[in-house]
Each structure stands twice: as structure tokens, then as C-alpha cells.
Interface confidence: low
């Protein structure tokens, strides 16, 4: 299953399959997730080791048993790959690292006014993988405001150095935020020239394209079909690059197929997995296990559940079958692709779905063994769980926010439905940033069921929580994916980096905002909050957030939206925007429904009609 916990001051011994430099443990974990063999990782922050060569070291590890001995190492961080973690699987990494210079091949230098602009330039440059920016206060004047665009053979820095007044980060192309745009066309009977960066075997050009998309240096590819004239080159997928970023030449060639990486696509990237099953095809590789199962789909499920399994072949040979079950060969290789592909067989083959974003149909939980006042504009994909709850009577208007917590579930505030309990007047918009982008053609979700907490009473602040079941499940993308829920009984004191988002009023007597707003607000203890609200009871099922001096807060129209906090590199839904005295007033914090206190209720209500839980319950 999915294991998200991190181990502080621990280092996994042995099992190394690769090593690289990464700026933090989260990026190291992402590289582990996308590495075909990595199950575990250990990361050495600069503070944890004196050896300069090992600082920022990210060590990717494999283990036949799925675990390795942990040794104590002060400052080290270890953890698991996020394979099998559904929507948490993403190559997108937005963080900016201050005081760090990520080294690589500097292929472009320009002057920019901010690190954000430098990141944008990197994202809009086809070859840029990461960047460094020298700030206005950099010690050498000649470097100030320099934006260095970089790449490396592996897509990660060749070294990372601690350096004051330098900020570094990665391209946001994997976040589907590139302005470059992409070529979706597949070119039949055409071979591209230029430099081969890798060679793998794939059953078709589409798998070849997805592998190219997630390979750090692949910009385009050529695939040789299974009827290509040279037998040893059949099913070969050549991943390619060039100085210019485009093929310098192409040659008409029978039985070849060429195309481009889709990494520069805007708003949508292909999933990093291959779900198609190939009948009459055998995939060769290292044998992991052989099991008898009923049907090729069950074979694929078995491979997906066995974390080390990369691909499979389901054999229908009479000697491989007994009764209704046949042999399911679970296999792996060094690069995650078959070492041999044979056609005209009595088998069916395919890949593990361990890297599919959709995962199972569960709501996300962490697993352990009102516009915003004083806010700023959000950017695409920054808060992919945020939804807009709109009412269509004669006109249509935004009324509340909400949080996507599963394919078919939205969590919001009960008071949003005061006086509007009819589910057919509601429209739910997900994956949007600007309300003005909504037209009559914009897709929306309709409500199948509104579940208001049984103890909620209109015009009272208690139990202000409601679940919405959507009529149809939503697909996850970089711009539309769920927020993880906290563990039951989570203590809010661990959260120091919390944000509230919404399209609500920017002042008490304001109006709904067009661009989704965000504001960073500190949590306030319930004791402190109670002092500020003498006339109300602040219960342990509420959480408060705000600045003593006011100025930043949720407001009308933000209700039902998320209060999210980042902890150990993971966002969790800590609160639901509920109520407050005015907006952003001095010493009047916002009051939020504390989600951790309602975990049992959420789990109970999100159980499907057949009784199967729609979310993983927190341990």
C-alpha cells in the first residue's frame, strides 16, 4: 500500500540503486517514486554531514522485502516511494530553495527582476530543468539578478552548494504550466535524427511517448514497430534530444513512428503509467512471482498491488491454466520496460498501474504504521482541491468554497446550504482559477447527495460541516486533485505553515473576487480564540486562525473552503472556513471546523452503497 511517513534521523542501509543531489527530502522522494526500482530513499541535508560530496545526497534504494535496516544518523531523512499513492504521485515540484545554488550546465543567462520570473523563464524554455537566481543582495554585483537556466544528464543538479542570496528551483513543466505548448501529433513512417538519450522496448508508440514525457532529457522520440525490417530493433523506442529542442531532420522510413514529449503541454499531462493491455503479446523480464488468477485484469491488479512488479504476462497456454485460473507472471527489469517483447503468443501483457494518478476510488487521508482579506492571487494548480460551489437560479453566482477529498466527494460547510438545500440548483466547478473563465460551456459537476452533519443547526456555529457526493466521479489532473485529510485526533499545534483560499470578499462590505486568493495565516490556540469570542463557545471541534493585528482573514464567499497546512512536505485539510466576527478585524480570528474531529463521521458517510470504504482510514 501507500506509505507516506518520513523517518527523521534515520538512514536506510544498503539496497542502493541510484544516487543524486536533491535540494530536500520531498524532491528525493519524488525521484524515488519515478525511478523504476526505487522503493525507499534516504536523504542527507547539508546540516547532517560534514562531507561536502555527500551533502544534499539523495540515495534511492530497492529491497526484495520492501524494507531495509534503519541506522541512526542525525539530520538524515528517510522514507518510502509514493508508488501506489494515487493522486499524490506528481513530478511537479514548485518549491524555491533560498540560500542554495543548484549546479548544472548553464546554457542561458539573463537578467530578471525576481526568482518567480526566473522560474517562469525556465518553465518556458524547452531545455531548462532547473535554475538559480542571484538576488539583488548577492555579494558580487556583476551576478545580481542573474537568472541561470540549467540542465544536466539526469535532470537533477550535478552538485548543490550552500550560497547566500541565491535561490534555486525546478522547471514547472511537470506541473503542466509551460507556455510552450506541445505537439500531440504522432508521425507515421517517419524517423527523427539527433542525439539518443535512452533506448527502451515498448509495445507501441504511445507508451514510448509517455516514457519520453517523463524522461528528464527526452524531447522527441522514434519508435520502430514490430514489423521493422531489422529484427533486433523491433519495438525499440529511441528517446532523443537536440540543441535546438526540435529534430534537426526527419527521414521517411517505413514502420517507424515519431513524436514529441508532452511535457510542455499546458493544463494536462499524460498519466505516468500505461493502462492498456496487449493481447497476444509476451513481456520478458526478471521473474518476480508467478500466481494463478482469474483473468488478465486480475493479473494487472495483482501486479499493481505488488509494489516491485513493473509489468506482467497472463498466459492462456493450456499447461499454464487450471480450472478458470491461469498463470500470471509478475516481472521487472532495470529500466522498468520489458527486456523482450514477443508477438503472436497465447498471452496478454501489460504494465503495473502503481504510478497512475487516479489510484483507487478512495478519499485521501494521511497514513501513519470567505475573497480572502489581505491575500494575493493564486496560480494555476497551486490549490488543486479548491472548488467553487455556485447556485443557478435566474442568474448564476459563486456562494461558497469547498475541498475535493475524493473522486466523488467534496467537503464544505453546512451553513452554505442554509435556505438552499435543493441539490439541483447547485453547480460545482473544479480545476479553475478565474471565475471569469466560467462560461456556459464550462463543465461542472452536479450533486447526487448533500450530507449535512446531523447535529448542525441553522445559525449556530457548531458542527458546520457537510459532504457533497457528486453525480459522476472526477478524473484527477495537476489542476484537479484531492487534499489529504488529517488523522483522527490530529493536534493542530504541529502545523506552522497554514493557508486559507477562496474567491470571497476582499473586505467586509466587498464583492466576490475573480482570481482565487490565498493568504498565509497562523493557527491560534483555542484558549486564545475563546478570549476573543466571549459570547460564543469555541469547542475542541473548532480551530482558529488569524493575526492579532488583523488584516488577513477569510470573508464572505470563502465559507466552506479549505484551511490547509503543510507538514513534512504534505498538505492536509485542517479546517473548513466557518465563521468569524466581521473579516480581518483586530483580535478577531477566523473560526474553522476542525476536520480531524470529524474523521469518523467522514469515513462513515463516504462508505459506498456496497459497504466498501471510499477512503483509506487513518491508522
Amino acid at each position: 500500500g501507500c506509505l507516506t511517513q518520513l523517518y527523521e534521523n534515520a538512514f536506510f542501509r544498503g539496497g542502493d540503486v541510484a544516487s543524486m543531489y536533491t535540494p530536500n527530502a520531498q524532491y528525493c522522494q519524488m525521484r524515488c517514486t519515478f525511478h523504476p526500482r526505487c522503493l525507499l530513499f534516504s536523504f542527507l541535508p547539508a546540516s547532517s554531514i560534514n562531507d561536502m560530496e555527500k551533502r544534499f545526497g539523495c540515495f534511492l534504494k530497492d529491497s526484495v522485502t520492501g524494507t531495509l535496516p534503519k541506522v541512526h544518523r542525525t539530520g538524515a531523512v528517510s522514507g518510502h516511494s509514493l508508488k501506489q499513492c494515487g493522486h499524490q504521485i506528481s513530478a511537479c515540484h514548485r518549491d524555491i530553495y533560498k540560500g542554495v545554488d543548484m549546479r548544472g550546465v548553464n546554457f542561458n543567462v539573463s537578467k530578471v527582476s525576481s526568482v518567480e520570473e526566473c522560474q517562469k523563464r525556465c518553465t518556458s524554455n524547452i531545455r531548462c530543468q532547473f535554475f538559480s537566481y542571484a538576488t539583488q543582495t548577492f555579494h558580487k554585483a556583476e551576478y545580481r539578478n542573474n537568472c541561470l537556466l540549467k540542465y544536466s544528464p539526469g535532470g537533477t543538479p550535478t552538485a548543490i552548494k550552500v550560497l547566500s542570496n541565491v535561490e534555486s528551483g525546478f522547471s514547472l513543466k511537470p506541473c503542466a504550466l509551460s507556455e510552450i505548448g506541445c505537439h500531440m501529433n504522432i508521425f507515421q513512417h517517419l524517423a527523427f535524427s539527433d542525439v539518443d538519450v535512452a533506448r527502451v522496448l515498448t509495445p507501441d508508440a504511445f507508451v514510448c511517448r509517455t516514457i519520453c514525457t517523463y524522461h528528464p532529457n527526452c524531447l522527441f522520440f522514434t519508435f520502430y514497430t514490430n514489423v521493422w525490417k531489422i529484427e533486433s530493433q523491433r519495438n525499440v523506442c529511441l528517446l532523443k534530444t537536440s540543441e535546438s529542442g526540435t529534430p534537426s531532420s526527419s527521414t521517411p522510413q517505413e514502420n517507424t513512428i515519431s513524436g514529441y514529449s508532452l511535457l510542455t503541454c499546458k493544463r494536462t499531462l499524460p498519466e505516468p503509467c500505461h493502462s492498456k493491455i496487449y493481447p497476444g503479446v509476451d513481456f520478458g523480464g526478471e521473474e518476480l512471482n508467478v500466481t494463478f488468477v482469474k483473468g488478465v485484469n486480475v493479473c494487472q491488479e495483482t501486479c499493481t498491488k505488488m509494489i516491485r512488479c513493473q509489468f506482467f504476462t497472463y498466459s492462456l497456454l493450456p499447461e499454464d491454466c487450471k480450472e478458470e485460473k491461469c498463470k500470471c507472471f509478475l516481472r521487472l527489469s532495470m529500466d522498468g520496460s520489458p527486456t523482450r517483447i514477443a508477438y503472436g503468443t497465447q498471452g496478454s501483457s501489460g504494465y503495473s498501474l502503481r504510478l497512475c494518478n487516479t489510484g483507487d476510488n478512495s478519499v485521501c487521508t494521511t497514513k501513519t504504521s470567505t475573497r480572502i482579506v489581505g491575500g494575493t492571487n493564486s496560480s494555476w494548480g497551486e490549490w488543486p482541491w479548491q472548488v467553487s460551489l455556485q447556485v443557478k437560479l435566474t442568474a448564476q453566482r459563486h456562494l461558497c468554497g469547498g475541498s475535493l477529498i475524493g473522486h466523488q466527494w467534496v467537503l464544505t460547510a453546512a451553513h452554505c446550504f442554509d435556505g438552499l438545500p435543493l441539490q439541483d440548483v447547485w453547480r460545482i466547478y473544479s480545476g479553475i482559477l478565474n471565475l471569469s473563465d466560467i462560461t456556459k460551456d464550462t463543465p461542472f459537476s452536479q450533486i447526487k447527495e448533500i450530507i449535512i452533519h446531523q447535529n448542525y443547526k441553522v445559525s449556530e456555529g457548531n458542527h458546520d460541516i457537510a459532504l457533497i457526493k457528486l453525480q459522476a466521479p472526477l478524473n484527477y489532473t495537476e489542476f484537479q486533485k484531492p487534499i489529504c485529510l488529517p488523522s483522527k485526533g490530529d493536534t493542530s499545534t504541529i502545523y506552522t505553515n497554514c493557508w486559507v483560499t477562496g474567491w470571497g470578499f476582499s473586505k467586509e462590505k466587498g464583492e466576490i473576487q475573480n482570481i482565487l486568493q490565498k493568504v498565509n495565516i497562523p493557527l491560534v490556540t483555542n484558549e486564545e480564540c475563546q478570549k476573543r469570542y466571549q459570547d460564543y463557545k469555541i469547542t475542541q471541534r473548532m480551530v482558529c486562525a488569524g493575526y492579532k493585528e488583523g488584516g488577513k482573514d477569510a470573508c464572505k464567499g470563502d465559507s466552506g473552503g479549505p484551511l490547509v497546512c503543510k507538514h513534512n512536505g504534505m498538505w492536509r485539510l485542517v479546517g473548513i472556513t466557518s465563521w468569524g466576527e466581521g473579516c480581518a478585524r483586530r483580535e478577531q480570528p477566523g473560526v474553522y471546523t476542525k476536520v480531524a474531529e470529524y474523521m469518523d463521521w467522514i469515513l462513515e458517510k463516504t462508505q459506498s452503497s456496497d459497504g466498501k470504504a471510499q477512503m483509506q482510514s487513518p491508522a
Epitope: 548553464n106 543567462v109 537578467k111 558580487k140 554585483a141 556583476e142
Partner: antibody, heavy 117, light 107 residues
Framework: QVQLQQSGAEVKKPGASVKVSCKAS????????MHWVRQAPGQGLEWMGA????????AYNQKFKGRVTMTRDTSTSTVYMELSSLRSEDTAVYYC??????????WGQGTLVTVSS | DIQMTQSPSSLSASVGERVTITCKAS??????LAWYQQKPGKAPKLLLY???GLEAGFHLRFSGSGSGTHYTLTISSLQPEDFATYYC?????????FGQGTKVEIK
């Protein structure tokens, strides 16, 4: 101190190519971009492009794209600017210039290229 | 490309006089502006850049101001060695572009 020493004057015929060199000293050659700026007689300054000697990365003014090529030789700390398909309006003084922080703090002495039939 | 328009194209002034040269960009260049001084037969010399950067070797009588698209170079008291051609240059976005120059002559 930083010094940029350029090659001598050239006279070329229309359609020919010219290659101007700029030898750098007094600093770490691979750490700084080198830019080329030209100035036609009695006219203003025009930025042509730049090369980063460390990576070999280049950025050209679209106006010259296809005609200009900038290269470097790290063993001699020299950058080169080659302009092809010369025409009379390419008659100008060609400067190499090194930025210091933002704009150009250090300039070569200039190389006069005359294009005449 | 960002167009840089300098005015006047030439001016005559006496020693001790205050001189102002303006430079207008076709779009906001966020203070990414440099001023150069060039004397006949010589390479340009960096004079001022950004919001505060007065290049070493030049006197404090030179000052720059402006924001957005409008910028000015002021010489508070013109000296004999200041007679030259002055160019502005934006380094906000490539291609980096220069103004057409202002020739400051002795009256």
C-alpha cells in the same frame, strides 16, 4: 584588471564572412557572458547577441539570426563572432563587451569591419 | 523588441549648466536601464545603471531617475570632460536595445 583585446580591422567584399576575436584576461573567463555590440559610422549602438563561455550557450538578436555565430575557445580565453553574407550596411565597429552585474562595464577597443566591393 | 527613444538627439550647453536627457521605453522596463558615455573613436563607458548604480570613475554630478517607461539622466553642473554622446540601454528583456544617442556639445 579586466581587459578585452580585439582583433584588427578587416575589409571584406559583400557576400563574404568575417570572424572577429576578443581575448579576455584579468578574470575567470568561463564565469561571465560575453556580448557583441556594433556601431555603424555616425550611428547608435546595436546589441547582436551573447555567449556564455562556461556552457557555450548563446542568445542572438533575431535580426542577425542565421547570419551570426558566436563561439569560444576556453583554452585561450577567446570568444569569436562570425557574421556571414556581409552587405554594405554591416560596415561598423564591432565591440565585445562584458557585463558587470547588469549592463556592460567592460568593452573591447572595437574592430572596424568595412564591407565594400 | 522594446524601443528606446532618447531626446533630444543633440543639445548645446555651457560649462556649469544643468543638463537633462530623457529616455522613453515602449513598455515598462522596471528600472533596468543603463546610461553610457561615448567619446569619438572610443568604446562606450558605463555611467549609471539600475536605481542607484553610479559606475566607478564618474562624478556624483551624474544622476539617474525615473520608473516604468520614463527615465532621465541629469548632469547637475556640466564640466568640459562631459562633452560626449550619451546612450541609454534597457536590459529588461532581450534583445537588449539602446536609445539612438544624445550628443552634448559645447555652446
Amino acid at each position: 584588471q579586466v581587459q578585452l583585446q580585439q582583433s584588427g580591422a578587416e575589409v571584406k567584399k559583400p557576400g563574404a564572412s568575417v570572424k572577429v576575436s576578443c581575448k579576455a584576461s584579468g578574470y575567470t573567463f568561463t564565469d561571465y557572458e560575453m556580448h557583441w555590440v556594433r556601431q555603424a559610422p555616425g550611428q547608435g549602438l546595436e546589441w547582436m547577441g551573447a555567449i556564455h563561455p562556461g556552457s557555450g550557450g548563446t542568445a542572438y538578436n533575431q535580426k542577425f539570426k542565421g547570419r551570426v555565430t558566436m563561439t569560444r575557445d576556453t583554452s585561450t580565453s577567446t570568444v569569436y563572432m562570425e557574421l556571414s553574407s556581409l552587405r554594405s550596411e554591416d560596415t561598423a565597429v564591432y565591440y565585445c563587451a562584458r557585463p558587470y552585474g547588469y549592463p556592460f562595464a567592460y568593452w573591447g577597443q572595437g574592430t572596424l569591419v568595412t564591407v565594400s566591393s | 523588441d522594446i524601443q528606446m527613444t532618447q531626446s533630444p538627439s543633440s543639445l548645446s550647453a555651457s560649462v556649469g549648466e544643468r543638463v537633462t536627457i530623457t529616455c522613453k521605453a515602449s513598455e515598462d522596463i522596471y528600472n533596468r536601464l543603463a546610461w553610457y558615455q561615448q567619446k569619438p573613436g572610443k568604446a562606450p563607458k558605463l555611467l549609471l545603471y539600475g536605481e542607484t548604480g553610479l559606475e566607478a570613475g564618474f562624478h556624483l554630478r551624474f544622476s539617474g531617475s525615473g520608473s516604468g517607461t520614463h527615465y532621465t539622466l541629469t548632469i547637475s553642473s556640466l564640466q568640459p570632460e562631459d562633452f560626449a554622446t550619451y546612450y541609454c540601454q534597457q536590459y529588461w528583456s532581450t534583445p537588449w536595445t539602446f536609445g539612438q544617442g544624445t550628443k552634448v556639445e559645447i555652446k
